[in-house]
């Protein structure tokens, strides 16, 4: 079993979770990657995935989730914008590698979203929020459906303590309606 740890982020409603998942360039640069939520007692659920093969620096948006895969950096950047209290939960990045089971990227993210004013006077997030107001072009993409021959055990408890979970215990579900969002730097 691989020992997994969690990194906790406590954010306010309306803020943006912005994390990066590091991966091995040579092995996974063009592999399809996904952002999942792990709910207690359930299999990991895929919320968004990159295209297959994954395109370099090409934003994919699913609702309030934006994925960008930077092949030259070996990083998958995940942003969840306009956070809501109900977004609270345990998340992880995984890499699809059929026919093998998905490869999990460390560490898991424990997101806690609370109500309340997120900023101080004069604070803003406009420079990034404007990006997502650009009229998107829509495309269809499917995240693979994996069925594991192994039994999926209960998801880790809601704590920030280290947890041990075998990599093989990851299952994914379909996600449709992937949206491409052009980003201008």
């Amino acid at each position: 079993a691989t020992k997994l740890t969690e990194e906790k982020y406590e954010l306010k409603e309306g803020q943006t979770l912005d994390v990066k998942c590091d991966y091995t360039l040579e092995k996974f640069a063009s592999s399809q990657k996904a952002w999942q939520i792990i709910r207690d007692g359930e299999m990991p659920k895929t919320l968004a995935c990159t295209e297959r093969p994954s395109k370099n620096s090409h934003p994919v948006q699913v609702g309030r989730i934006i994925l960008e895969d930077y092949h030259d950096h070996g990083l998958l950047r995940v942003r969840m914008v306009n956070l809501q209290v109900e977004d609270s939960g345990l998340y992880q990045c995984v890499i699809y590698q059929p026919p093998k089971e998905p490869h999990m990227l460390f560490d898991r993210i424990r997101l806690v979203v609370t109500k309340g004013f997120s900023g101080t006077p004069g604070s803003n997030e406009n420079s990034t929020q404007n990006v997502y107001k650009i009229p998107p072009t829509t495309t269809k993409a499917l995240c693979p459906l994996y069925t594991s021959p192994r039994t999926v055990t209960q998801a880790p408890p809601k704590s920030t303590a280290d947890v041990s979970t075998p990599d093989s215990e990851i299952n994914l579900t379909n996600v449709t309606d992937i949206i491409r969002v052009p980003v201008f730097n």
Partner: antibody
């Protein structure tokens, strides 16, 4: 317990070289990005260089680009900083720091090693 | 490069009082901001990250707020061990990762 221990600092003349080492323990070294951060005497903190864990990607501050090289030996749980063409303004305490898996913020730091560049 | 500006440079506060430190980014960094504490002769210590999340083992009297370009570190009731220099750092987008110039919290 996470521990980071720097070594290799000392006095060197301008134009000289030094190699800093940072031996780590208490976490799975290969999984995490590591950075070098320096602090000139009586001054603030300046990020110097970063090396990612899985990807091995490297990044440098403009002030050291082309002169410093960051590397790591995952089998020895050690991070390195090769410093060439040293300048007086490179004089500082050099800290190695472990980063979060998910972002470049520094959750564990070494005690630092002093590099003095002087003629 | 994102420039981080802290104010004030020095803050004189009596023990038990509240201290409010400010950090401003030259462009939006969302919530990608951390605060560190450094005491003389010691390495920095992570206090707050993600603008408002307390790091492991950090007392509840330390709190962070803000988003975008304006951030605040508040120490609700200063203890003797809190007198130190405090730095903010942005970790938005790509390197270079930049720090503010620091705020020294001294005994009034």
């Amino acid at each position: 317990e996470v521990q980071l221990l720097e070594s290799g600092g000392g006095m060197v003349q301008p134009g000289g070289s030094l190699r800093l080492s940072c031996a780590v323990s208490g976490f799975t070294f290969s999984r995490y990005a590591m950075s070098w951060v320096r602090q000139a005497p009586g001054k603030g903190l300046e990020w110097v260089s970063e090396m990612r864990g899985s990807s091995g990607s490297t990044y440098y501050a403009d002030s050291v680009k082309g002169r410093f090289t960051i590397s790591r030996d995952n089998s020895k749980n050690t991070l390195y900083l090769q410093m060439n063409s040293l300048r007086v303004e490179d004089t500082a305490i050099y800290y190695c720091a472990k980063e979060f898996s998910s972002n470049s913020l520094f959750d564990y730091w070494g005690q630092g090693t002093l590099v003095t560049v002087s003629s | 490069e994102i420039v981080m500006t802290q104010s004030p440079a020095t803050l004189s506060v009596s023990p038990g009082e509240r201290a409010t430190l400010s950090c401003r980014a030259s462009q939006s960094v969302n919530a990608n901001l951390a605060w560190y504490q450094q005491k003389p002769g010691q390495a920095p210590r992570l206090l707050i990250y993600g603008a408002s999340t307390r790091a492991t083992g950090i007392p509840a009297r330390f709190s962070g707020s803000g988003s975008g370009t304006e951030f605040t570190l508040t120490i609700s009731s200063l203890q003797s061990e809190d007198f130190a220099v405090y730095y903010c750092q942005q970790f938005y987008n790509w390197p270079p990762w930049t720090f503010g110039q620091g705020t020294k919290v001294e005994i009034k």
